[in-house]
């Protein structure tokens, strides 16, 4: 009886198991009642990082120095380059597609620490009783407007992206 | 396009003064924080001083507190940097740049040579 499923490293096809090809190679031919699967190293440039029944091999990435990149890492048949940016600057994600020269602090997020040549910005939530409402790479958190200070009574309460609204206290006639 | 053009550098004597500005387009200026980053020869980037976006706001790096003085002109898409009490550590290469700095929007900048 034909399987329903296979074993680790294995792929189904035609009612029948065929082996998956190695990280670092790609599927040629599907194996048959008589003979193995065929699997083909990638080329040059090229990688498959997984055990794998893909035709063609990926492409590994670019190090584009027109967006600051540089390899960190050079690839080979079964891992991607990685890149990283250029000294005193910093990637805008985890993939480092492109360099900026620092991270903003969202709203709601002050500096806690400015960038430098080696580390970037560090943000902070705003605590209770704080805000920012703006992107920014060297402002801090600002602490709510004291209403008492100017004899007026809170209207609206602060959050973290927010100040108070001062307003008239009600007189008592 | 993205475009930061610096002038205003030169050579100068250590005590000297001198004015940076940067004009910039292909943005809405008036928006934007804004920042003067400068590098030393054979020395990694400095951040020097930053502004918000109307003016209000600035920072200063400590090497730099209380002889820099940052400013800009919304209306004339222009931010400016005033140099006193210059010192031959300033000499740099001064860069302006908007927030956030793409890589590919660095401008070329403008030397600052401090010297007698």
């Known amino acids: 009886e034909p399987p329903t499923a296979c074993r680790e490293k294995q792929y189904l096809i035609n009612s029948q198991c065929c082996s998956l090809c190695q990280p670092g190679q790609k599927l040629v031919s599907d194996c048959t009642e008589f003979t193995e699967t065929e699997c083909l190293p990638c080329g040059e440039s090229e990688f498959l990082d997984t055990w794998n029944r893909e035709t063609h091999c990926h492409q590994h990435k670019y190090c584009d120095p027109n967006l600051g990149l540089r390899v960190q890492q050079k690839g080979t048949s079964e891992t991607d380059t990685i890149c990283t940016c250029e000294e005193g600057w910093h990637c805008t994600s985890e993939a480092c597609e492109s360099c900026v020269l620092h991270r903003s602090c969202s709203p709601g997020f002050g500096v806690k620490q400015i960038a430098t040549g080696v580390s970037d910005t560090i943000c902070e939530p705003c605590p209770v009783g704080f805000f920012s409402n703006v992107s920014s790479a060297f402002e801090k958190c600002h602490p709510w407007t004291s209403c008492e200070t100017k004899d007026l009574v809170v209207q609206q309460a602060g959050t973290n992206k927010t100040d108070v609204v001062c307003g008239p206290q009600d007189r008592l006639r | 396009e993205v475009q930061l053009l610096e002038s205003g550098g030169g050579l100068v004597q250590p005590g000297g003064s001198l004015r940076l500005s940067c004009a910039a387009s292909?943005?809405?200026?008036?928006?934007?924080e804004m920042w003067w980053v400068r590098q030393a020869p054979g020395k990694g980037l400095e951040r020097v001083s930053?502004?918000?976006?109307?003016?209000?706001?600035?920072y200063y790096a400590d090497s730099v507190k209380g002889r820099f003085t940052i400013s800009r002109d919304n209306s004339k898409n222009t931010l400016y940097l005033q140099m006193n009490s210059l010192r031959a550590e300033d000499t740099a290469v001064y860069y302006c740049?908007?927030?956030?700095?793409?890589?590919?929007?660095w401008g070329q900048g403008t030397l600052v040579t401090v010297s007698s």
């Open positions: 740049a908007k927030l956030p700095t793409y890589f590919k929007d």
């Open positions: 292909g943005f809405t200026f008036r928006d934007y």
């Open positions: 930053a502004i918000n976006p109307q003016g209000t706001r600035t």
